[in-house]
């Protein structure tokens, strides 16, 4: 019996087609992805093959103005329109709190939304009961397939799930649910979830009875043969893991941003064992036409976005200096504003020992592309912020050793004075440079804001300590020459859309007046 699994993950509100790098589509003839194009390909496969499941492995939420405006209603509407069969909860589905998940998505989705390792407690337990499930048995033709969901246990540090959801260890939580499916005589089981490729592989290895793992969170690109675009494969598709009980378990992921549609064909024997698996992600490029009906619906929904981008978010009573003459040479108040917003967006009261789990931010000055003039009545709009942060990036959470941070700050000024983008703006960090010293030895003082303290204060950076830092995904990926971050990071979790972080902060503050306050000094 043959099953076709179509899968997406980490779409991050790319409802419209995008450029090849998943930013805003500029030249339509070279654009990719988007739900209208995805629908064309999905329908093509559904028409050609008998047993097809369309699955999403989480993080539909967060990433473009679509999410900012529609807050998840767009996800439910268009996933319903594409007739998804199941979705696993990702960490970003909690970005607007549990209510922001329940109302727009859980109550509106026609498909089951899954996670076996999220347990509700307290008053939430009855409110959310039945709105998401640990697993679902799906009929496919004359057979049944069990889908069991999972979500990153780090979600409380990455999003806003509140205090009434407990995120258990994935493997511990999955095993009893898979066992339950086995007792229901379900012998074909897919683990669908959002914990990253390393955890996906562990699930394949450790959870008895899981036949296939469809993952997300790490934006992993797998491919067999010559890849069709710029993404470099992390391994073959499917990636085969030998389980502890000796089975070959295919593990798949489909990069991110709706650029690819994962396509996996699995052949099962009559006892539900995987006989063979093959496939590849399908690049959703312009050779696949956008479905006109879905496209018309997208255009209808778009109208509200255009109106939103010119509305006032808040006011500034000072000039927001985002000029390259400032932000690539010295502390600039636009950099301070953005870093403060980044930290504010990551406030999660962890426990009594820590005032927060993260206190530091770094931001490449070259990523700040425009100032905002306060003389226009002080008004700040989404449109203004899009000029400051035009790349559609995210502000991510990483864990780094102190020694890596020190290298990063040395890199920040290794060729100072040439108006290059790697000069770092900061938050929760006090840095002093001595430019008379040779490159690689110019950081003379580096103090960082404590997190394990009731009154935050600045202490010298410790080389062997592990620190959490918020930074642009561009830096996490080694951009602007920060190879040491990419090579040495100990953990990387993708965060919220950059403009959304800053716009939310400005809306919250209402009136802003960021200063230059001595975060970066030269001796």
């Amino acid at each position: 019996w043959e099953l076709t699994i179509l899968h997406t993950n980490d779409v991050h509100s790319r409802l419209e087609q995008t450029s090849e790098d998943s930013s805003k589509c500029v030249n339509a003839s070279r654009c990719m992805g988007g739900v209208a194009r995805l629908f064309t390909k999905v329908q093509q496969i559904r028409r050609a093959e008998p047993n097809v499941l369309l699955l999403d492995a989480g993080d539909q939420y967060q990433g473009t103005i679509w999410f900012t405006v529609y807050k998840g209603a767009e996800v439910a509407h268009f996933m319903n329109a594409l007739r998804y069969d199941a979705m696993a909860l990702g960490n970003h589905e909690f970005d607007n709190g549990v209510e922001g998940l329940i109302e727009p998505l859980l109550k509106e989705a026609k498909f089951p939304i899954l996670s076996a390792n999220i347990k509700a407690k307290g008053p939430l337990a009855s409110q959310i009961s039945g709105l998401y499930l640990p697993y679902k048995v799906l009929p496919v033709g004359d057979e049944v397939v069990g889908i069991v969901g999972y979500t990153s246990k780090e979600t409380p540090f990455l999003s806003n799930p509140g205090t009434n959801l407990v995120f258990e260890d994935e493997i511990t939580a999955l095993q009893p649910e898979v066992d339950k499916l086995k007792t229901l005589n379900v012998n074909k089981i897919i683990a669908l979830g959002h914990s990253g490729f390393e955890t996906d592989k562990l699930i394949a290895q450790k959870v008895r009875g899981v036949d296939v793992v469809v993952g997300g969170h790490s934006n992993t690109f797998l491919y067999t043969g010559n890849p069709p675009s710029k993404e470099v494969p992390a391994g073959k598709y499917p990636f085969i893991v030998t389980s502890d009980d000796g089975r070959k378990v295919p593990v798949v992921q489909a990069y991110a941003f709706g650029k690819y549609l994962g396509y996996l064909k699995i052949e099962f024997d009559e006892r539900g064992n995987v006989i063979s698996s093959h496939g590849n992600p399908i690049l959703l490029n312009s050779s696949i036409p956008e479905d006109p009906s879905i496209k018309a619906d997208i255009n209808k929904w778009r109208i509200k976005l255009d109106n939103y981008s010119t509305q006032e978010l808040g006011k500034t009573i000072v000039y927001l200096d985002g000029s390259s003459q400032s932000c690539r040479f010295r502390e600039c108040n636009m950099g301070n504003l953005i870093c403060d917003a980044m930290i504010n967006n990551n406030l999660r009261h962890a426990d009594e020992m820590f005032w927060n789990h993260v206190s530091m931010c770094i931001l490449n000055g070259g990523g700040i592309r425009s100032p905002i003039d306060e003389r226009n009545n002080g008004t700040i709009t989404w449109e203004n912020l899009a000029a400051v942060l035009p790349f559609g990036g995210t502000f991510d959470l990483v864990q780094l050793k102190g020694s890596t941070l020190k290298k990063a700050f040395e890199h920040s000024v290794h060729r100072y004075g040439q108006s290059t983008g790697e000069f770092l703006q900061v938050g929760g960090i006090h840095v002093v440079y001595d430019l008379s010293r040779k490159p690689g030895d110019r950081v003379v003082k580096l103090d960082v804001l404590c997190t394990k303290c009731r009154v935050p204060s600045y202490d010298p950076l410790k080389m062997d300590e592990i620190y959490k830092v918020i930074l642009p995904n561009f830096l996490a990926n080694g951009g602007d020459g920060f190879q040491m971050i990419k090579d040495e990071l100990l953990r990387h979790d993708s965060g919220d859309q950059d403009i959304n972080v800053v716009s939310t902060y400005i809306s919250k503050m209402k009136v802003i007046y960021p200063a230059v306050e001595g975060r970066i000094k030269f001796s």
């Epitope: 028409r47 009929p139 496919v140 033709g141 479905d291």
Partner: antibody, heavy 121, light 107 residues
């Protein structure tokens, strides 16, 4: 082979009740949404009811809502339509039809031969 | 409710003719449209689903097209066994609705 066979039709007085059955064979009945569709003499097709594969949802058009109830017994591979408060305009051939394997609306790939219901005093 | 309007309501054609039947939805239904053939005193038979997919066992002279609100069923070369009534049906949303039918008669 895949087959649907309706039964239970007949002549009934207005205001009375009737229960139709549909016996399924040749496929995994519990995996499919099942529908009733009717056709009044000389008229077109009208959808009457659906029950999801797992019985979790049932839908009806306004014309029968509150009077007709669709049900199924997966252990017996049988679909039912309980028709109460029958009216003259319910006179039609009633077909049972197989839908899809999901919770989305679907088309009908297999039809029964139909059973005639006449509501007349 | 979504209204389905079929045209023409009847047509006369000869064996070998190309026949086109149209179906219009009162609102967008994407490609969630099916076509059925019904002969007198018989149950309907599924021809096409998802606007353009041929049901297995249906001759290739039948084809469907369209998306959104406007759909077409085409019989490329009418055969004697094709004289029947044809219905379209939307399955975008409940309640499911049919077109009024198009009767194809011998000229």
């Amino acid at each position: 082979q895949v087959q649907l066979v309706e039964s239970g039709g007949g002549v009934v007085q207005p205001g009375r009740s009737l229960r139709l059955s549909c016996a399924a064979s040749g496929f995994t009945f519990s995996n499919y949404g099942m529908h009733w569709v009717r056709q009044a003499p000389g008229k077109g097709l009208e959808w009457v009811a659906v029950i999801w594969y797992d019985e979790s949802n049932k839908y009806y058009p306004d014309s029968v809502k509150g009077r007709f109830t669709i049900s199924r017994d997966n252990s017996k591979n049988t679909l039912y339509l309980q028709m109460n408060s029958l009216r003259a305009e319910d006179t039609a051939v009633y077909y049972c039809a197989r839908g899809g394997s999901s919770w989305y609306p679907d088309s009908f790939d297999i039809w029964g031969q139909g059973t005639m219901v006449t509501v007349s005093s | 409710d979504i209204q389905m309007t079929q045209s023409p309501s009847s047509l006369s054609a000869s064996v070998g003719d190309r026949v086109t039947i149209t179906c219009r939805a009162s609102q967008g239904i994407s490609s969630w449209l099916a076509w059925y053939q019904q002969k007198p005193e018989k149950a309907p038979k599924s021809l096409i689903y998802a606007a353009s997919s041929l049901q297995s066992g249906v001759p290739s002279r039948f084809s469907g097209s369209g998306s959104g609100t406007d759909f077409t069923l085409t019989i490329s070369s009418l055969q004697p066994e094709d004289f029947a009534t044809y219905y379209c049906q939307q399955y975008n949303s409940y309640p499911l609705t049919f077109g009024g039918g198009t009767k194809v008669e011998i000229k």
